[in-house]
Amino acid sequence: RPSRVYKPEGNTKRALTLKDILNGTFSYKTYFPNWISEQEYLHQSEDDNIVFYNIETRESYIILSNSTMKSVNATDYGLSPDRQFVYLESDYSKLWRYSYTATYYIYDLQNGEFVRGYELPRPIQYLCWSPVGSKLAYVYQNNIYLKQRPGDPPFQITYTGRENRIFNGIPDWVYEEEMLATKYALWWSPDGKFLAYVEFNDSDIPIIAYSYYGDGQYPRTINIPYPKAGAKNPVVRVFIVDTTYPHHVGPMEVPVPEMIASSDYYFSWLTWVSSERVCLQWLKRVQNVSVLSICDFREDWHAWECPKNQEHVEESRTGWAGGFFVSTPAFSQDATSYYKIFSDKDGYKHIHYIKDTVENAIQITSGKWEAIYIFRVTQDSLFYSSNEFEGYPGRRNIYRISIGNSPPSKKCVTCHLRKERCQYYTASFSYKAKYYALVCYGPGLPISTLHDGRTDQEIQVLEENKELENSLRNIQLPKVEIKKLKDGGLTFWYKMILPPQFDRSKKYPLLIQVYGGPCSQSVKSVFAVNWITYLASKEGIVIALVDGRGTAFQGDKFLHAVYRKLGVYEVEDQLTAVRKFIEMGFIDEERIAIWGWSYGGYVSSLALASGTGLFKCGIAVAPVSSWEYYASIYSERFMGLPTKDDNLEHYKNSTVMARAEYFRNVDYLLIHGTADDNVHFQNSAQIAKALVNAQVDFQAMWYSDQNHGILSGRSQNHLYTHMTHFLKQCFSLSD
């Protein structure tokens, strides 16, 4: 046959288009096994069958067919621990960030049919199996119900539930968003005997009300009990009920530690230690003191006792307790001692082993880096993630400490697996860490693999995104660099996304993408093809993300620098970085912009109003404009209270409105969803009012009935198209 003439590929690759981004053309997949034992897991296949896998026997079969799923339009499932039943979840209806309601059907795997009689009410706010057997706990209309078996009539555990007033087993808005980060507030004991839950009383909390326009003649009003900074907070109580005979004693209240109960406080988390031991974490309203309380069930008293000598206090003298949240304990097999991440004497968050008192804690990890999460503690190993490797704060590697050895030996499980491709991992462990899955998020294409928990040997590739790899072959992707810059005694890590044919001798427009919130991190070694990737690829814009003071995992000195003075250093450090980027020689000083969303919208607004003349234009999406408008738990964690004798002055000084005059010389695009339950539209309304009062011209866009994520497909298309036009106009880029 005729020989092929070899043609060098040349530049046949195309740039990314905005359409690619909006259609999610280059989205990646991850694979998290749904572990059901030491060596077995379930996974939902591409065609929606629920497949059972046994790693050791290599057996796999469909445990629940897609036709059964489809028969009730199920989008999720949950297998009972005795493997006799599966709940099927359908009619998913999102509420806030984590919460949603749904309809649940129980399928009997033995009979191959749905359980009839005493069907679950709808819609249910939360449902879960007990850890043993097939008891069901669920929340309906803010009350908790229990079923001893799926076919049994339910037992009502709580009677106090009332819409927008009292929540049992589910958090109210502020606890869901700012404290628990879950849709649930109930926890089974390991043997399924006890059920712990929280009651949130919001009766005295002020209501945020906003219009939801819908399609009707009249808008409806959404009312949410939402404590803003300094307002009355939810009153929380923790109860435990014996699910064997719940009707006998009824729910038993767990006492709050005296040093916590003496003033306003929060419940922060609950961890079951054993079948009759529970660990509760509490936090003072002024969030620099956290108390971990270990409570035991006293059979003779039929009560939960929390002795004072089982209270462990964690206090920060330089800022707030914990990172974003106070860390949770990982208990040892002895059900007494535990491992926990908190700041060491040098202000770096590290793993400590607590046997009796926090004062006598043994530090397990140390160094000028931070331990981030404890995944699992087994008889002989502790698995955790950190950003230690090669000194890059934006990496995540998984480490194993052999706690059986003295001294404990440390091994990095992931550091050298796929070094170029993978520098940011998370993990998912089977019951006693006999096996685990690693999910790598980048910087290369994400990949999920299965490993032996003893040898760390890779057993199988679960997902390697081959299709994505193939479809990206003909795309001109930008080059991504993660580096650091120094200013005075400070080091700032940044990520720069450079256009495909980047030439240092040329000048490029610069867009700063900022978040900058306390204990956040933007400079991460992760893969992404998103709007800013497109801007670099197609529009030739240099993008930079900078982690300034207040961001996470670089020690408390860096983190707590913003304590009680939000809106100062976060902005200053973005400005410093821009000046450094200009010095690099390839930035067109006349074409620099900044944009951010949420906290990033706050920082971008303040940066634009800094009066430096560095920015030509900028965008703020759903910005906070005053910390008095935001949630109590968040605002007060970092700012204290907006009272005269506390920090009212800085609350007032740090508003966007206070700097309205300074927007005169920049092009400002202000965007907000009118149904934002999180950062209320009020924030942008007040910015707009202040700009109008100051006679400052600006652009604005609202998204009717959209929340903080502006997530609806149509709105998102419009949003990114609109922002693209704005930027291209600002940078004088042809359409």
Epitope: Q148, P153, F155, H248, V249, W301, H302
Partner: antibody, heavy 117, light 108 residues
Framework: EVQLLESGGGLVQPGGSLRLSCAAS????????MSWVRQAPGKGLEWVSA????????YYADSVKGRFTISRDNSKNTLYLQMNSLRAEDTAVYYC??????????WGQGTLVTVSS | EIVLTQSPGTLSLSPGERATLSCRAS???????LAWYQQKPGQAPRLLIY???SRATGIPDRFSGSGSGTDFTLTISRLEPEDFAVYYC?????????FGQGTKVEIK
């Protein structure tokens, strides 16, 4: 040994009030929900009211809702039932019992309430 | 509310005989929440069975309970003289807790 001792019963006119007490001993009173159960002469048992161990939650039968109030003083190990607007049909022996909704594992000896003009 | 109907209303038996008492619920009750009590004249009720089939402390093994759903049974295998009394079933599944109207076991 668990003991429950009711007191406060007696004769009262319709529309009148009475306060029953139940002194508890032999167990950690504050840990347990407690109930009042009554028995009209020659009739069966009827649950009247219950209160959680901490006293934070109370429950009532429809027949007494709005008229009776259950309370407890954990420092005194005592359960109370305040009965207002009494009617002839409230005539019964009132027992205090240890439990929320059952099983009622310990009962007092009962106190007789007679509502009559 | 759940209505519990006991049958028979009266059971006339001799000591040594077997007594079978029935309790029917107007709607299904999880067995965990069903109890039986014994009451003698002038005395407070005494718990016999909880969880439909578990004997309370100190209750002799001639007393046994069974059943599920809507039908429950209390059985006294061999009646002793002290067993002649009124027996009540009770559900604690749904507020308000309710009692059956009672079955009187009398000496024949």
């Amino acid at each position: 040994e668990v003991q429950l001792l009711e007191s406060g019963g007696g004769l009262v006119q319709p529309g009148g009030s009475l306060r029953l007490s139940c002194a508890a001993s032999g167990f950690t009173f504050s840990s347990y929900a407690m109930s009042w159960v009554r028995q009209a002469p020659g009739k069966g048992l009827e649950w009247v009211s219950a209160i959680s161990g901490s006293g934070g939650s109370t429950y009532y039968a429809d027949s007494v809702k709005g008229r009776f109030t259950i309370s407890r003083d954990n420092s005194k190990n005592t359960l109370y039932l305040q009965m207002n607007s009494l009617r002839a049909e409230d005539t019964a022996v009132y027992y205090c019992a240890k439990a929320w909704m059952g099983p009622f594992d310990y009962w007092g000896q009962g106190t007789l309430v007679t509502v009559s003009s | 509310e759940i209505v519990l109907t006991q049958s028979p209303g009266t059971l006339s038996l001799s000591p040594g005989e077997r007594a079978t008492l029935s309790c029917r619920a107007s709607q299904s009750v999880s067995s965990s929440y069903l109890a039986w009590y014994q009451q003698k004249p002038g005395q407070a009720p005494r718990l016999l069975i909880y969880g439909a089939s578990s004997r309370a402390t100190g209750i002799p093994d001639r007393f046994s309970g069974s059943g599920s759903g809507t039908d429950f049974t209390l059985t006294i295998s061999r009646l002793e003289p002290e067993d002649f009394a009124v027996y009540y079933c009770q559900q604690g599944h749904i507020i308000p807790p309710t009692f059956g109207q009672g079955t009187k076991v009398e000496i024949k």
